[in-house]
């Protein structure tokens, strides 16, 4: 049903092979990616409430597909996972608090996160860091999951399996 308005290959936005997405836009795609569909000549990426398409041979398309296949994107893009061991300042944490990459069920916590993400980048201070530098963003919203996963999809339970020493300090939740 390629080209169909109602089918899985309908595109809300088409990105030309001549002008690949910026790094910032790629980060946004990684964060909000929910699914992809292979169409005849292009791939459609389903995000939270919109879709974007790109040519099947475009490097950024292959990168995003691989990212979702390995559950490193979408709900799995865990920039604010409570029980992380490493937090590097080179990649700003901008995502859902879960290891799970799929979610057909949206909990109130997920909806809160989605709301916050539209304006701010939530981060989580981590108590035991293995990296050289500690990342602190005092002016940004902080969500503390208290070791609970906020996704209902695959791998959602991973964060609960970490030893207590990996958990970050309790953080203040502020939503405006």
């Amino acid at each position: 049903n390629e080209g169909s308005v109602t089918g899985s290959c309908y595109c809300g936005k088409r990105i030309s092979s001549d002008s690949p997405p910026s790094v910032q836009f790629m980060n946004r795609l990684r964060k909000h990616l929910r699914a992809y569909h292979r169409c005849l000549y292009y791939t459609r990426f389903q995000l939270l409430s919109w879709s974007v398409c790109g040519g099947n041979k475009d490097p950024w398309v292959q990168e995003l597909m691989s990212c979702l296949d390995l559950k490193e994107c979408g709900h799995a893009y865990s920039g604010i996972v409570a029980h992380q061991k490493h937090l590097l300042p080179t990649s700003p944490p901008i995502s859902q608090a879960s290891e799970g990459a799929s979610s057909d069920i949206h909990t109130p916590a997920q909806m809160l996160l989605s709301t916050l993400q539209s304006t701010q980048r939530p981060t989580l201070p981590v108590g035991s860091l293995s990296s050289d530098k500690e990342l602190t963003r005092p002016n940004e919203t902080t969500i503390h999951t208290a070791g609970h996963s906020l996704a209902a999809g695959p791998e959602a339970g991973e964060n609960q399996k970490q030893p207590e020493k990996n958990a970050g300090p309790t953080a203040r939740t502020s939503a405006t």
């Epitope: 597909m65 990649s91 791998e155």
Partner: antibody, heavy 118, light 113 residues
């Protein structure tokens, strides 16, 4: 050609430490999710640990049996993964395999033997 | 944790015959994000590491003979070895990589009659 080469195994006394290395080549290491899997002689396969990619802050996950004793890390600039094993127990005796999960499949190394014995 | 139940535990087949190994997971391995099943099949011979035969439940790894076929979806999967050869004598494992911890089936030992 994809290659994963483990090293660092050997004989160690209970309570001792070892650091395993896994040198990778033939694929984009930084995009791969790395895991360690072990196999005791004549037994089945047991997952040990996992480390995610840089966009996910190299988050690590461990089997309950090794939590608090093993530490998984990676150096993307060297295409190498490491497993630091402390407080080793006799039940940790096994062949340790480094694996790389990519969208093109799960690659395995030849393994390195860890023997914990007094 | 996802439990992988493999059957049979051993299988004796004559050369040229077809061998069928089953694997059942305690929960679905189909991921809605890409409609892929997160299941792999391995072959392991004595003294060697596991060799990947099939991933995404049905995708044959490069270099693997086409007599090895993976099928199934959701919770029920099958590895079929058509026209079994002497070199197929090995232990075969299924593995789910849908969730951490990765879990493996108990293995199926394929012997030649």
């Amino acid at each position: 050609e994809v290659q994963l080469v483990e090293s660092g195994g050997g004989l160690v006394q209970p309570g001792g430490s070892l650091k395993l290395s896994c040198a990778a080549s033939g694929f984009t290491f930084s995009n791969a999710v790395m895991n360690w899997v072990r196999q005791a002689s004549g037994k089945g396969l047991e997952w040990v640990a996992r480390i995610r990619t840089k966009p996910n802050n190299y988050a690590t996950f461990y089997a309950d049996s090794v939590k608090g004793r093993f530490t998984f890390s990676r150096d993307d600039s060297k295409n190498t993964a490491y497993l630091q094993m402390n407080s080793l127990k006799t039940e940790d005796t096994a062949m340790y395999y480094c694996t790389a999960w990519t969208t093109e499949g799960i690659y395995w190394g030849q393994g390195t033997l860890v023997t914990v014995s007094s | 944790d996802i439990v992988m139940t493999q059957s049979p535990s051993s299988l004796a087949v004559s050369l040229g015959e077809t061998a069928t190994i089953n694997c059942k997971s305690s929960q679905s391995l189909l991921y809605s994000g890409n409609q892929k099943n997160y299941l792999a099949w391995y072959q392991q011979k004595p003294g060697q590491p596991p060799k990947l035969l099939i991933y995404w439940a049905s995708t044959r790894q490069s270099g693997v003979p086409d007599r090895f076929t993976g099928s199934g979806a959701g919770t029920d999967f099958t590895l079929t070895i058509s026209s079994v050869q002497a070199e197929d004598l090995a232990i075969y494992y299924c593995q789910q990589y849908y969730d951490t911890p990765w879990t493996f089936g108990g293995g199926t030992k394929v012997e030649i009659k």
